[in-house]
């Protein structure tokens, strides 16, 4: 019989608003009061097993006690009504859970999208957390027809996909209702034609066709998405070279109406391009499609757009009446080769007479020439045709080169080695820059580059190493032959020397010592030696440092103490720091030469 509860709490399943007040009433049953000899005064209220202070109780009558909570801040409160029975034993009467939360906020920013081939999906912001189960329902209607409600799933409460087919060109009104145990609110209504919310499928079957007639164009063709039968489209076409990471875009005004092909112009010959395309409603109302799959195409070859860089070297050990000349040239970069270079054609004309032709697959040609003046020409050939000719005058043996560049400077900047000069007054056809690494261990093997006659500043185009000394030579080339070369040394990046100088004594006197050292080998300098510092000390004394100009190879220490052991070492400094050499010791004599004790 006592399995039946001794009483009950009202309300039974309360849902209350956070930070509000709440009152619960426990009503005891007569049979229970009789059995335990209790009344409402014996009621003890507990929350989550903690006793609530009596001040919060109100005895309503002999059977009922109430408890009031102010500013509820817990989301779940287990509230129990208990009675004190014989010998102060606590007996549970009834228990409830007080659930607290917030009413829903008005949903905001309602928007809809129709992905082609799918049904309309709308999404919204639901506002603050309610801590309660809150149902969101998307409502939609025509002026003449109500559509089935779309109930948002519990795991995606801020969006819903309708169950009916989208109808374009008929305005629809859409809104969201949010409801929980504490209230119901409605979003603002939005009214629109779904055709203005379309996200088309991307164009497909994108393909690229090149043109034999024009090496600067590629024609794109594609299949439009099915929605083309309903709306007019505009496009965004992007392209890049195969190895680039950034995309270029066709001007929007060129692709602003429905089409299924487009010719991209002003492309580089013999270059692989990657294309992609997306589309949207022509008037810009709606959403861009995703990008199509990418498609590649290669522009047709064009004749090389530039003559190769062209230079020569004369073997100094030439036989009587002849000299060995090595003609050399650079391969054209792809953007100038405009195709696969098949071969090079070299012609050599002795002054006003004999012509020799050579077809070469390499980038050099060694020829034996007389001591006369020659004119050499070079063209590069691909499938389409030949480049313009590079022309080089190889002067006669007795030619005296003059007119060098002036004010030659070289300096590192932005991880490149820059060279600049003042142009000679005479008309320069081109400049040849040669550079090599100076080393005590290996000969100076030169690389080279050509610059236009109008240039007076450039950077060396090669794989340059840090902390290596480069000897850079600039030769102006005139119509009648090369001018005088000018050279300069430079570093891409300096470092402290790898080794310090080894100091030794040249002569030691009673109060002075002449120190000497060798210049550091270029391989260990790692930069320009700006100065030396000599450090010397006695065993008991402080160290003294003396700065010495880098042009010196000896130095005299004066005011030394006689009959004393000195320790000396030397450091060499570049712009990036210094390095000490080994320590050396010497002892000053007790007496000067010829001095008697």
């Amino acid at each position: 019989e006592l399995l039946d509860p001794c009483g009950y709490i009202s309300p039974e399943s309360p849902v209350v608003q956070l930070h509000s007040n709440f009152t619960a009433v426990c009503v005891l049953k007569e049979k229970c009061m009789d059995y335990f000899h209790v009344n409402a005064n014996y009621i003890v209220w507990k929350t989550n097993h903690f006793t609530i202070p009596k001040e919060q109780y109100t005895i309503i009558n002999r059977t009922a006690s109430s408890v009031t909570f102010t500013d509820i801040s817990s989301l779940n409160i287990q509230l129990t009504c208990n009675i004190l029975t014989f010998g102060q034993l606590e007996q549970n009467v009834y228990g409830i859970t007080i659930i607290s939360g917030l009413p829903p906020e008005k949903p905001k920013n309602l928007s809809c999208i129709v992905n082609e081939g799918k049904k309309m999906r709308c999404e919204w912001n639901r506002g603050r957390e309610t801590h309660l189960e809150t149902n969101f329902t998307l409502k939609s209607e025509w002026a003449t027809h109500k559509f089935a409600d779309c109930k948002a799933k519990r795991d995606t409460p801020t969006s819903c996909t309708v169950d009916y087919s989208t109808v374009y060109f008929v305005n629809i009104e859409v809104w969201v209702e949010a409801e929980n145990a504490l209230g119901k609110v409605t979003s603002d209504h939005i009214n629109f034609d779904p055709v203005y919310k379309v996200k088309p499928n991307p164009p497909h079957n994108l393909s690229v066709i090149n043109s034999e007639e024009l090496s600067s164009i590629l024609k794109l063709t594609w299949t439009n998405p099915s929605i083309k039968s309903v709306i007019r489209l505009k496009y965004n076409i992007q392209y890049r070279t195969k190895d680039a990471s950034t995309w270029s875009q066709i001007p929007p005004e060129d692709t602003a109406s429905t089409r299924s092909s487009f010719t991209v112009q002003d492309l580089k010959p013999f270059t692989e391009y990657v294309f992609r395309i997306c589309c949207m409603k022509e008037d810009g109302k709606g959403y861009w499609s995703d990008w199509s799959e990418e498609a590649n195409g290669i522009t047709y070859e064009d004749r090389p757009s530039k003559a190769p860089s062209f230079w020569y070297k004369i073997d100094p050990s030439h036989a009587q009446g002849y000299r060995t000349v090595q003609l050399m040239w650079k391969t054209l970069p792809p953007f100038e080769a405009n195709g696969k270079i098949l071969d090079y054609e070299v012609t050599l004309t002795r002054w006003k007479s004999h012509l020799q032709n050579y077809t070469v697959n390499d980038t050099k040609l060694t020829v034996n020439l007389t001591n006369d003046r020659y004119v050499a020409t070079l063209t590069a050939r691909n499938l389409v045709g030949k480049s313009d000719a590079a022309v080089l005058t190889i002067p006669a043996c007795d030619f005296q080169a003059t007119h060098p560049v002036m004010d030659l400077k070289a300096f590192p900047k932005d991880n490149m080695l820059w060279v600049e000069w003042t142009t000679p007054r005479e008309s320069v056809k081109k400049y040849i820059l040669e550079w090599c690494v100076l080393s005590d261990k290996a000969p100076c093997i030169a690389d080279w580059q050509q610059e236009d006659g109008t240039v007076h500043r450039t950077h060396l185009r090669g794989n340059l190493a840090e902390s290596k000394c480069y000897l850079i030579t600039v030769t102006p080339v005139y119509a009648d032959g090369p001018g005088s070369p000018e050279s300069i040394k430079a570093y891409l990046k300096q470092a402290p020397p790898s080794k310090g100088p080894t100091v030794r004594t040249k002569k030691v006197g009673k109060n002075e010592a002449v120190l000497e050292w060798d210049q550091l080998p270029v391989d260990v300098q790692n930069g320009f030696i700006r100065n030396y510092t000599i450090f010397y000390r006695t065993i008991i004394g402080n160290e003294t440092a003396v700065n010495v100009d880098s042009s010196h190879t000896e130095y005299t220490l004066s005011s030394l103490t006689s009959d004393t052991l000195y320790m000396v070492r030397m450091a060499a400094y570049t712009d990036e720091g210094g390095k000490d050499g080994p320590e050396f010791t010497f002892t000053t004599p007790k007496f000067a030469q010829g001095e008697i004790e």
């Epitope: 081939g117 929605i227 039968s229 309903v230």
Partner: antibody
Framework: QVQLQESGPGLVKPSETLSLTCTVS????????WTWIRQPPGKGLEWIGH???????NYNPSLKSRVTISVDTSKNQFSLKLTSVTAADTAVYYC??????????????????????WGQGTTVTVSS | DIQMTQSPSSLSASVGDRVTITCRAS??????LNWYQQKPGKAPKLLIY???SLQSGVPSRFSGSGSGTDFTLTISSLQPEDFATYYC??????????FGQGTRLEIK
């Protein structure tokens, strides 16, 4: 109450051009497709084509090379031109209104509504 | 083109009868089929659109059903004014719109 009235010659010579006009009264020409349908004597209905108020046209592929439909919104009229007619073009020609509304089902598209207002029809005979 | 085939081509019935006309599409047209009624010497009149939606002003004894390829027009209790020819029409938006060949409903 919207009404449609076809007008044009009842007799056209073979190889000439058939021209008909449909006048819309009692309502706007906007927000609808305006359709031409024909019915040869004792036969079924054949859709010729239609035009929207913005001028977008759709034609029956079997007639496309010979048909032009145009609209004049200022006069609330739309017209049909059918070139190079033969005796097979003899029919009752109807104009009709099709409310805008295209339903999307996957990537297929359907006119949602039916042709809800029709003219009474005009008989055109092709004969020399 | 989508072909529409109506059956029967003609049928005889009496006032008060329940009559069913069927229409079959050569490929799926979802639920986008319309039914028209045409009386001799008159223009067709729209009865049902989108397979089952009753056009405004049309008596409720007319009803439509079906989807995909098979559709029916039902007249629940035939009235004297219902004797006419009935056409189905598919409304696929890519041309052409096509009609069935018609079903002639006569008084028995």
């Amino acid at each position: 109450q919207v009404q449609l009235q076809e007008s044009g010659p009842g007799l056209v010579k073979p190889s000439e051009t058939l021209s008909l006009t449909c006048t819309v009264s009692g309502g706007s020409i906007s927000n609808y497709y305006w359709t031409w349908i024909r019915q040869p004597p004792g036969k079924g209905l054949e859709w010729i084509g239609h035009i929207s108020n913005s001028g977008t046209t759709n034609y029956n592929p079997s007639l496309k090379s010979r048909v032009t439909i145009s609209v004049d919104t200022s006069k609330n009229q739309f017209s049909l031109k059918l070139t190079s007619v033969t005796a097979a073009d003899t029919a009752v020609y109807y104009c009709a209104r099709l409310p805008l509304g295209i339903a999307a089902v996957d990537t297929d598209y359907y006119y949602y509504f039916g042709m809800d207002v029709w003219g009474q029809g005009t008989t055109v005979t092709v004969s020399s | 083109d989508i072909q529409m085939t109506q059956s029967p081509s003609s049928l005889s019935a009496s006032v008060g009868d329940r009559v069913t006309i069927t229409c079959r599409a050569s490929q799926s047209i979802s639920s986008y089929l319309n039914w028209y009624q045409q009386k001799p010497g008159k223009a067709p009149k729209l009865l049902i659109y989108a397979a089952s939606s009753l056009q405004s002003g049309v008596p409720s004894r007319f009803s439509g059903s079906g989807s995909g390829t098979d559709f029916t027009l039902t007249i629940s209790s035939l009235q004297p004014e219902d004797f006419a020819t009935y056409y189905c029409q598919q409304s696929y938006s890519t041309p052409p719109i096509t009609f069935g060949q018609g079903t002639r409903l006569e008084i028995k």
